[in-house]
Protein backbone atom coordinates (compact mmCIF):
# COMPACT_ATOMS: atom_id res chain seq x y z
CA UNK A 1 0.00 0.00 0.00
CA UNK A 2 1.60 3.41 -1.23
CA UNK A 3 -0.31 6.24 1.46
CA UNK A 4 -0.76 9.68 0.69
CA UNK A 5 1.91 11.67 -1.37
CA UNK A 6 0.87 15.10 0.54
CA UNK A 7 3.69 16.30 2.55
CA UNK A 8 2.21 18.00 5.63
CA UNK A 9 6.28 19.77 6.08
CA UNK A 10 6.04 21.43 3.15
CA UNK A 11 6.97 20.98 -0.86
CA UNK A 12 10.05 19.05 -1.06
CA UNK A 13 10.73 18.45 2.69
CA UNK A 14 9.50 14.65 2.33
CA UNK A 15 10.86 11.82 1.20
CA UNK A 16 11.43 11.76 -2.60
CA UNK A 17 13.95 11.20 -4.93
CA UNK A 18 16.67 13.52 -5.84
CA UNK A 19 20.58 13.89 -7.51
CA UNK A 20 23.78 14.37 -6.16
CA UNK A 21 26.42 15.24 -8.56
CA UNK A 22 29.15 12.74 -7.69
CA UNK A 23 32.72 12.64 -9.53
CA UNK A 24 34.58 9.03 -9.53
CA UNK A 25 37.30 10.35 -6.71
CA UNK A 26 33.93 11.06 -4.39
CA UNK A 27 32.82 7.62 -4.70
CA UNK A 28 36.61 6.22 -4.57
CA UNK A 29 35.60 4.35 -8.05
CA UNK A 30 39.00 6.40 -9.43
CA UNK A 31 41.01 3.74 -9.72
CA UNK A 32 38.15 0.58 -11.41
CA UNK A 33 35.95 2.72 -13.28
CA UNK A 34 36.80 4.83 -16.46
CA UNK A 35 33.56 6.20 -17.94
CA UNK A 36 31.51 8.22 -16.92
CA UNK A 37 33.75 10.95 -15.14
CA UNK A 38 30.97 11.94 -13.49
CA UNK A 39 27.58 10.44 -11.95
CA UNK A 40 24.01 11.91 -11.32
CA UNK A 41 23.49 10.08 -8.53
CA UNK A 42 19.56 10.06 -7.81
CA UNK A 43 18.77 9.10 -4.04
CA UNK A 44 16.33 9.17 -2.07
CA UNK A 45 15.99 12.06 0.93
CA UNK A 46 13.70 13.29 2.97
CA UNK A 47 11.36 13.06 6.30
CA UNK A 48 9.08 10.43 6.57
CA UNK A 49 6.42 12.16 8.51
CA UNK A 50 2.82 9.92 9.53
CA UNK A 51 1.94 7.31 6.63
CA UNK A 52 3.84 9.86 3.85
CA UNK A 53 4.50 7.01 0.90
CA UNK A 54 4.57 4.09 3.89
CA UNK A 55 5.69 1.22 1.93
CA UNK A 56 3.88 -1.70 3.52
CA UNK A 57 2.11 -2.63 6.71
CA UNK A 58 5.60 -2.86 8.20
CA UNK A 59 5.76 0.73 8.07
CA UNK A 60 2.57 2.06 9.28
CA UNK A 61 3.30 -0.20 12.18
CA UNK A 62 6.56 1.88 12.44
CA UNK A 63 4.62 4.98 12.18
CA UNK A 64 2.59 4.33 15.51
CA UNK A 65 5.49 2.97 17.38
CA UNK A 66 7.54 5.71 17.17
CA UNK A 67 4.56 7.78 17.71
CA UNK A 68 4.59 5.85 21.17
CA UNK A 69 8.21 5.10 21.45
CA UNK A 70 10.34 7.93 19.55
CA UNK A 71 13.47 6.99 21.95
CA UNK A 72 13.24 3.39 21.06
CA UNK A 73 11.93 2.95 17.66
CA UNK A 74 12.68 5.14 14.80
CA UNK A 75 10.59 7.08 12.36
CA UNK A 76 10.13 4.94 9.17
CA UNK A 77 13.23 6.17 6.43
CA UNK A 78 13.39 6.74 2.97
CA UNK A 79 14.46 4.61 0.61
CA UNK A 80 14.43 3.06 -2.67
CA UNK A 81 11.50 1.55 -3.99
CA UNK A 82 13.11 0.43 -7.45
CA UNK A 83 16.53 0.93 -9.30
CA UNK A 84 17.49 1.91 -12.93
CA UNK A 85 20.38 0.24 -14.02
CA UNK A 86 23.74 1.96 -15.32
CA UNK A 87 26.40 1.12 -17.54
CA UNK A 88 29.74 1.42 -16.07
CA UNK A 89 32.93 1.12 -18.46
CA UNK A 90 35.56 -0.49 -16.17
CA UNK A 91 39.22 -1.16 -16.15
CA UNK A 92 40.41 -4.77 -16.33
CA UNK A 93 43.72 -6.47 -16.68
CA UNK A 94 43.59 -6.67 -20.49
CA UNK A 95 41.95 -3.31 -21.17
CA UNK A 96 37.87 -2.56 -20.12
CA UNK A 97 34.98 -4.15 -19.73
CA UNK A 98 30.92 -2.99 -19.69
CA UNK A 99 29.20 -3.63 -16.85
CA UNK A 100 25.68 -3.26 -16.07
CA UNK A 101 24.65 -2.43 -11.96
CA UNK A 102 20.96 -2.58 -11.36
CA UNK A 103 20.91 -1.53 -7.99
CA UNK A 104 22.66 1.62 -8.10
CA UNK A 105 20.90 4.29 -8.98
CA UNK A 106 17.13 5.03 -7.37
CA UNK A 107 14.17 5.34 -9.23
CA UNK A 108 11.40 6.08 -7.07
CA UNK A 109 11.07 6.32 -3.09
CA UNK A 110 8.81 5.27 -0.28
CA UNK A 111 8.91 4.95 3.28
CA UNK A 112 9.36 1.91 4.96
CA UNK B 1 26.43 -7.89 -1.60
CA UNK B 2 26.21 -8.27 1.94
CA UNK B 3 29.09 -5.96 3.78
CA UNK B 4 30.68 -6.55 6.91
CA UNK B 5 28.27 -7.59 10.01
CA UNK B 6 31.07 -6.16 12.83
CA UNK B 7 29.50 -3.28 14.19
CA UNK B 8 32.63 -0.37 15.26
CA UNK B 9 29.90 1.29 17.55
CA UNK B 10 29.98 -2.11 20.27
CA UNK B 11 27.74 -4.40 20.31
CA UNK B 12 24.15 -3.89 19.22
CA UNK B 13 24.48 -0.45 18.28
CA UNK B 14 24.26 -1.26 14.49
CA UNK B 15 21.79 -2.24 12.42
CA UNK B 16 20.04 -5.49 13.71
CA UNK B 17 16.54 -7.25 14.64
CA UNK B 18 14.46 -6.26 17.32
CA UNK B 19 11.18 -7.38 18.98
CA UNK B 20 9.19 -4.35 20.40
CA UNK B 21 6.14 -5.28 21.74
CA UNK B 22 2.77 -3.17 21.25
CA UNK B 23 -1.14 -4.19 21.88
CA UNK B 24 -3.81 -3.64 19.70
CA UNK B 25 -4.29 -0.21 20.85
CA UNK B 26 -0.95 0.55 20.42
CA UNK B 27 -0.98 -0.37 16.64
CA UNK B 28 -4.49 1.29 15.87
CA UNK B 29 -5.72 -2.15 15.24
CA UNK B 30 -8.26 -2.94 18.00
CA UNK B 31 -11.35 -1.82 15.85
CA UNK B 32 -10.50 -4.11 13.63
CA UNK B 33 -8.57 -7.03 14.89
CA UNK B 34 -9.60 -9.97 17.14
CA UNK B 35 -6.26 -11.64 17.61
CA UNK B 36 -3.67 -11.67 18.88
CA UNK B 37 -4.10 -9.29 21.43
CA UNK B 38 -0.82 -8.45 21.36
CA UNK B 39 2.25 -8.87 19.06
CA UNK B 40 5.89 -8.99 18.80
CA UNK B 41 6.88 -6.52 16.28
CA UNK B 42 9.82 -7.69 14.95
CA UNK B 43 11.87 -4.30 13.04
CA UNK B 44 15.31 -3.24 12.25
CA UNK B 45 16.88 -0.45 14.06
CA UNK B 46 20.31 0.86 14.80
CA UNK B 47 23.10 2.94 13.19
CA UNK B 48 24.62 2.14 9.31
CA UNK B 49 28.44 3.05 9.70
CA UNK B 50 30.37 2.68 6.69
CA UNK B 51 29.43 0.10 4.78
CA UNK B 52 27.99 -2.20 7.64
CA UNK B 53 25.68 -4.84 6.12
CA UNK B 54 25.13 -2.78 2.56
CA UNK B 55 22.23 -4.13 0.86
CA UNK B 56 23.77 -3.35 -2.82
CA UNK B 57 25.92 -0.50 -4.53
CA UNK B 58 23.33 2.13 -3.63
CA UNK B 59 23.96 1.77 -0.14
CA UNK B 60 27.57 2.00 -1.27
CA UNK B 61 27.32 5.19 -3.01
CA UNK B 62 25.51 6.59 -0.08
CA UNK B 63 28.09 5.90 2.79
CA UNK B 64 30.34 7.93 0.98
CA UNK B 65 28.48 10.55 0.08
CA UNK B 66 27.64 10.75 3.40
CA UNK B 67 30.72 11.35 4.47
CA UNK B 68 31.37 13.84 1.81
CA UNK B 69 28.05 16.10 2.15
CA UNK B 70 26.91 14.64 5.71
CA UNK B 71 24.46 17.69 5.66
CA UNK B 72 22.92 17.03 1.86
CA UNK B 73 23.12 13.53 2.09
CA UNK B 74 21.79 11.18 5.17
CA UNK B 75 23.81 8.13 6.12
CA UNK B 76 22.53 4.53 5.28
CA UNK B 77 18.85 3.25 7.05
CA UNK B 78 18.27 0.26 8.78
CA UNK B 79 15.44 -1.54 7.15
CA UNK B 80 14.08 -5.56 6.60
CA UNK B 81 15.62 -7.26 4.12
CA UNK B 82 13.52 -9.63 4.24
CA UNK B 83 9.81 -10.61 6.71
CA UNK B 84 8.32 -13.57 7.89
CA UNK B 85 3.95 -13.80 7.57
CA UNK B 86 1.97 -13.11 10.57
CA UNK B 87 -1.88 -14.18 10.33
CA UNK B 88 -4.58 -11.95 12.17
CA UNK B 89 -7.88 -13.00 13.06
CA UNK B 90 -9.65 -10.11 11.72
CA UNK B 91 -13.48 -8.89 12.54
CA UNK B 92 -15.57 -9.07 9.33
CA UNK B 93 -19.40 -7.76 8.42
CA UNK B 94 -20.34 -11.52 9.05
CA UNK B 95 -17.97 -12.49 11.79
CA UNK B 96 -14.46 -13.61 11.66
CA UNK B 97 -11.51 -13.75 9.19
CA UNK B 98 -7.73 -15.26 9.22
CA UNK B 99 -5.66 -12.75 7.05
CA UNK B 100 -2.22 -13.43 6.30
CA UNK B 101 0.16 -10.38 6.06
CA UNK B 102 3.55 -10.79 4.43
CA UNK B 103 4.87 -7.63 4.94
CA UNK B 104 4.77 -6.65 9.06
CA UNK B 105 7.24 -8.50 10.61
CA UNK B 106 11.10 -7.88 9.53
CA UNK B 107 12.98 -11.29 9.73
CA UNK B 108 16.11 -10.06 8.49
CA UNK B 109 18.23 -6.45 8.05
CA UNK B 110 20.57 -4.47 6.02
CA UNK B 111 21.67 -0.62 5.36
CA UNK B 112 20.16 1.16 2.56
CA UNK C 1 27.99 28.89 8.55
CA UNK C 2 27.43 28.97 5.18
CA UNK C 3 29.44 32.01 3.89
CA UNK C 4 30.96 32.25 -0.04
CA UNK C 5 33.32 35.73 0.45
CA UNK C 6 33.86 37.68 -2.86
CA UNK C 7 35.93 41.15 -2.89
CA UNK C 8 33.88 44.23 -3.32
CA UNK C 9 35.24 45.27 -6.81
CA UNK C 10 37.97 45.36 -9.58
CA UNK C 11 38.90 47.79 -11.90
CA UNK C 12 41.15 46.71 -14.73
CA UNK C 13 42.54 47.68 -18.04
CA UNK C 14 41.44 46.90 -21.55
CA UNK C 15 43.36 44.12 -22.30
CA UNK C 16 44.50 42.90 -19.19
CA UNK C 17 43.33 40.31 -16.77
CA UNK C 18 41.91 40.05 -13.50
CA UNK C 19 41.64 37.03 -11.08
CA UNK C 20 38.69 36.92 -8.98
CA UNK C 21 38.48 34.46 -5.43
CA UNK C 22 35.71 33.20 -3.63
CA UNK C 23 36.42 31.96 -0.01
CA UNK C 24 34.36 28.94 1.03
CA UNK C 25 33.81 28.61 4.55
CA UNK C 26 31.57 26.68 6.93
CA UNK C 27 31.31 23.40 4.91
CA UNK C 28 33.91 20.86 3.40
CA UNK C 29 34.58 22.74 0.09
CA UNK C 30 35.87 19.87 -1.79
CA UNK C 31 32.39 18.60 -1.27
CA UNK C 32 30.48 20.41 -2.98
CA UNK C 33 30.47 22.03 -6.92
CA UNK C 34 31.58 25.53 -7.09
CA UNK C 35 29.88 27.29 -9.86
CA UNK C 36 30.90 31.52 -11.48
CA UNK C 37 27.52 33.26 -13.11
CA UNK C 38 27.73 36.64 -14.22
CA UNK C 39 25.54 39.41 -14.66
CA UNK C 40 25.84 42.71 -16.82
CA UNK C 41 24.27 46.31 -15.70
CA UNK C 42 20.96 46.04 -15.58
CA UNK C 43 20.95 42.73 -17.41
CA UNK C 44 19.89 39.14 -16.54
CA UNK C 45 22.17 36.21 -15.18
CA UNK C 46 24.37 34.30 -17.39
CA UNK C 47 26.06 31.13 -16.10
CA UNK C 48 29.99 31.16 -16.91
CA UNK C 49 30.80 27.39 -15.85
CA UNK C 50 31.16 25.41 -12.67
CA UNK C 51 34.70 23.59 -11.02
CA UNK C 52 34.52 20.46 -8.88
CA UNK C 53 37.04 21.69 -6.20
CA UNK C 54 38.14 17.95 -4.91
CA UNK C 55 39.66 17.23 -8.72
CA UNK C 56 39.95 20.68 -9.81
CA UNK C 57 37.60 19.34 -13.01
CA UNK C 58 35.86 22.25 -14.74
CA UNK C 59 33.16 22.99 -17.52
CA UNK C 60 32.14 26.12 -19.70
CA UNK C 61 29.81 27.65 -21.13
CA UNK C 62 31.13 27.71 -24.84
CA UNK C 63 30.48 31.46 -24.61
CA UNK C 64 33.42 31.89 -21.77
CA UNK C 65 35.62 29.05 -23.02
CA UNK C 66 38.40 31.33 -24.31
CA UNK C 67 37.61 34.25 -21.79
CA UNK C 68 37.53 32.44 -18.52
CA UNK C 69 39.87 29.92 -16.98
CA UNK C 70 38.37 28.09 -13.29
CA UNK C 71 40.76 26.63 -10.74
CA UNK C 72 40.73 25.38 -7.12
CA UNK C 73 42.96 25.82 -4.27
CA UNK C 74 42.21 23.16 -1.32
CA UNK C 75 44.43 24.44 0.82
CA UNK C 76 43.12 27.65 1.10
CA UNK C 77 39.31 26.84 0.19
CA UNK C 78 39.00 29.35 -2.59
CA UNK C 79 37.91 29.08 -5.80
CA UNK C 80 39.23 31.02 -7.94
CA UNK C 81 38.10 32.63 -12.03
CA UNK C 82 40.57 34.09 -14.43
CA UNK C 83 39.18 36.65 -17.03
CA UNK C 84 41.85 37.59 -19.84
CA UNK C 85 41.97 40.16 -22.82
CA UNK C 86 39.26 42.38 -20.51
CA UNK C 87 37.04 44.63 -22.96
CA UNK C 88 34.42 46.90 -21.88
CA UNK C 89 31.83 43.78 -22.43
CA UNK C 90 33.24 42.05 -20.04
CA UNK C 91 32.12 44.83 -17.35
CA UNK C 92 29.71 43.08 -14.86
CA UNK C 93 29.39 42.03 -11.52
CA UNK C 94 30.86 38.25 -11.44
CA UNK C 95 29.16 36.17 -8.49
CA UNK C 96 30.05 32.35 -7.13
CA UNK C 97 28.00 30.15 -5.96
CA UNK C 98 27.25 26.54 -4.31
CA UNK C 99 25.51 23.54 -6.19
CA UNK C 100 23.82 21.24 -3.70
CA UNK C 101 20.70 18.68 -4.68
CA UNK C 102 19.10 18.68 -8.01
CA UNK C 103 21.64 21.53 -9.44
CA UNK C 104 20.28 24.08 -7.00
CA UNK C 105 22.64 26.52 -6.21
CA UNK C 106 21.51 27.51 -2.87
CA UNK C 107 24.12 29.28 -1.32
CA UNK C 108 25.65 32.59 -3.64
CA UNK C 109 28.90 35.35 -2.77
CA UNK C 110 27.87 39.08 -2.76
CA UNK C 111 29.63 39.10 -5.77
CA UNK C 112 32.77 41.06 -7.57
CA UNK C 113 31.99 44.28 -9.69
CA UNK C 114 34.49 44.14 -12.48
CA UNK C 115 34.69 47.60 -14.06
CA UNK C 116 36.55 47.22 -17.54
CA UNK C 117 38.08 51.22 -18.12
CA UNK C 118 41.24 52.78 -19.38
CA UNK D 1 21.06 25.46 -25.62
CA UNK D 2 17.73 25.39 -23.54
CA UNK D 3 16.24 28.86 -23.72
CA UNK D 4 14.07 29.45 -21.08
CA UNK D 5 11.64 32.17 -22.01
CA UNK D 6 10.13 33.95 -18.71
CA UNK D 7 6.49 36.46 -18.32
CA UNK D 8 5.10 38.97 -17.90
CA UNK D 9 8.29 41.05 -18.17
CA UNK D 10 6.64 43.01 -15.43
CA UNK D 11 3.92 42.74 -12.80
CA UNK D 12 2.09 44.90 -10.14
CA UNK D 13 0.37 43.30 -7.74
CA UNK D 14 -1.78 44.15 -4.58
CA UNK D 15 -0.58 43.39 -0.97
CA UNK D 16 -2.65 39.83 -0.07
CA UNK D 17 -3.51 39.02 -3.51
CA UNK D 18 -1.31 36.07 -5.56
CA UNK D 19 1.39 36.74 -8.11
CA UNK D 20 2.11 34.32 -10.65
CA UNK D 21 5.23 33.93 -13.27
CA UNK D 22 5.69 31.63 -15.82
CA UNK D 23 8.78 30.32 -17.51
CA UNK D 24 8.79 28.16 -20.69
CA UNK D 25 11.67 25.59 -21.50
CA UNK D 26 12.41 25.69 -25.47
CA UNK D 27 13.20 21.83 -24.66
CA UNK D 28 11.95 19.78 -21.87
CA UNK D 29 14.31 20.11 -18.59
CA UNK D 30 13.00 16.31 -16.93
CA UNK D 31 15.44 13.82 -16.42
CA UNK D 32 14.79 10.77 -14.28
CA UNK D 33 11.44 11.75 -13.40
CA UNK D 34 12.74 15.47 -12.08
CA UNK D 35 12.37 18.28 -13.70
CA UNK D 36 15.49 20.43 -13.09
CA UNK D 37 13.94 23.75 -12.94
CA UNK D 38 15.13 26.26 -10.33
CA UNK D 39 13.40 29.90 -8.84
CA UNK D 40 15.42 32.66 -7.76
CA UNK D 41 14.40 36.42 -6.03
CA UNK D 42 16.90 39.12 -6.43
CA UNK D 43 17.01 42.35 -4.98
CA UNK D 44 18.88 45.66 -5.85
CA UNK D 45 22.64 44.76 -4.98
CA UNK D 46 22.17 41.55 -3.93
CA UNK D 47 23.04 37.96 -5.08
CA UNK D 48 20.28 36.54 -6.06
CA UNK D 49 18.42 33.90 -3.70
CA UNK D 50 17.14 30.26 -4.23
CA UNK D 51 13.27 30.28 -3.65
CA UNK D 52 12.75 26.70 -5.31
CA UNK D 53 14.68 24.14 -6.40
CA UNK D 54 13.47 21.17 -8.87
CA UNK D 55 9.99 22.88 -9.78
CA UNK D 56 8.38 22.21 -6.56
CA UNK D 57 10.44 21.97 -3.68
CA UNK D 58 10.85 25.39 -1.32
CA UNK D 59 14.38 26.41 -0.51
CA UNK D 60 15.98 26.19 2.85
CA UNK D 61 14.32 29.28 4.86
CA UNK D 62 11.81 30.27 2.24
CA UNK D 63 8.22 31.44 3.54
CA UNK D 64 5.44 29.28 2.87
CA UNK D 65 4.31 31.58 0.47
CA UNK D 66 6.44 30.96 -2.46
CA UNK D 67 5.31 27.97 -4.51
CA UNK D 68 6.28 26.43 -7.96
CA UNK D 69 4.85 24.02 -9.81
CA UNK D 70 5.29 22.33 -13.87
CA UNK D 71 7.12 19.88 -15.43
CA UNK D 72 8.52 19.28 -18.52
CA UNK D 73 8.80 22.39 -20.46
CA UNK D 74 5.88 24.77 -18.48
CA UNK D 75 6.64 26.20 -14.95
CA UNK D 76 5.41 28.60 -12.76
CA UNK D 77 6.31 30.49 -9.40
CA UNK D 78 3.37 31.70 -7.27
CA UNK D 79 3.41 34.02 -4.47
CA UNK D 80 0.54 34.14 -2.21
CA UNK D 81 -0.25 36.30 -0.05
CA UNK D 82 2.09 39.05 -1.64
CA UNK D 83 3.66 41.05 0.88
CA UNK D 84 6.13 43.95 0.76
CA UNK D 85 9.23 42.45 1.03
CA UNK D 86 8.19 40.56 -2.39
CA UNK D 87 8.76 43.18 -4.79
CA UNK D 88 12.05 42.00 -6.84
CA UNK D 89 13.38 40.43 -9.91
CA UNK D 90 12.66 36.77 -10.37
CA UNK D 91 14.25 34.53 -12.18
CA UNK D 92 13.60 30.60 -13.73
CA UNK D 93 16.67 28.85 -14.34
CA UNK D 94 17.36 25.10 -15.35
CA UNK D 95 20.28 22.97 -14.41
CA UNK D 96 18.95 20.03 -16.52
CA UNK D 97 21.83 20.47 -19.72
CA UNK D 98 25.47 22.24 -19.55
CA UNK D 99 24.92 25.43 -20.03
CA UNK D 100 22.88 25.87 -17.65
CA UNK D 101 20.64 28.78 -18.64
CA UNK D 102 18.55 32.18 -16.64
CA UNK D 103 15.04 33.17 -17.99
CA UNK D 104 15.22 36.80 -18.58
CA UNK D 105 13.46 37.80 -15.74
CA UNK D 106 10.51 39.32 -14.08
CA UNK D 107 9.94 42.47 -12.36
CA UNK D 108 7.59 42.54 -9.58
CA UNK D 109 6.23 45.49 -7.62
CA UNK D 110 3.60 46.68 -5.71
CA UNK D 111 0.15 47.95 -7.26
Known amino acids: ARNGDHCPLGPGRCCRLHTVRASLEDLGWADWVLSPREVQVTMCIGACPSQFRAANMHAQIKTSLHRLKPDTVPAPCCVPASYNPMVLIQKTDTGVSLQTYDDLLAKDCHCI | ARNGDHCPLGPGRCCRLHTVRASLEDLGWADWVLSPREVQVTMCIGACPSQFRAANMHAQIKTSLHRLKPDTVPAPCCVPASYNPMVLIQKTDTGVSLQTYDDLLAKDCHCI | QVQLQQPGAELVKPGASVKLSCKASGYTFTSYWIHWVNQRPGQGLEWIGDINPSNGRSKYNEKFKNKATMTADKSSNTAYMQLSSLTSEDSAVYYCAREVLDGAMDYWGQGTSVTVSS | DIVLTQSPASLAVSLGQRATISCRASESVDNYGISFMNWFQQKPGQPPKLLIYAASNQGSGVPARFSGSGSGTDFSLNIHPMEEDDTAMYFC?????????FGGGSKLEIK
Open chain 4, 93 to 101: QQSKEVPWT
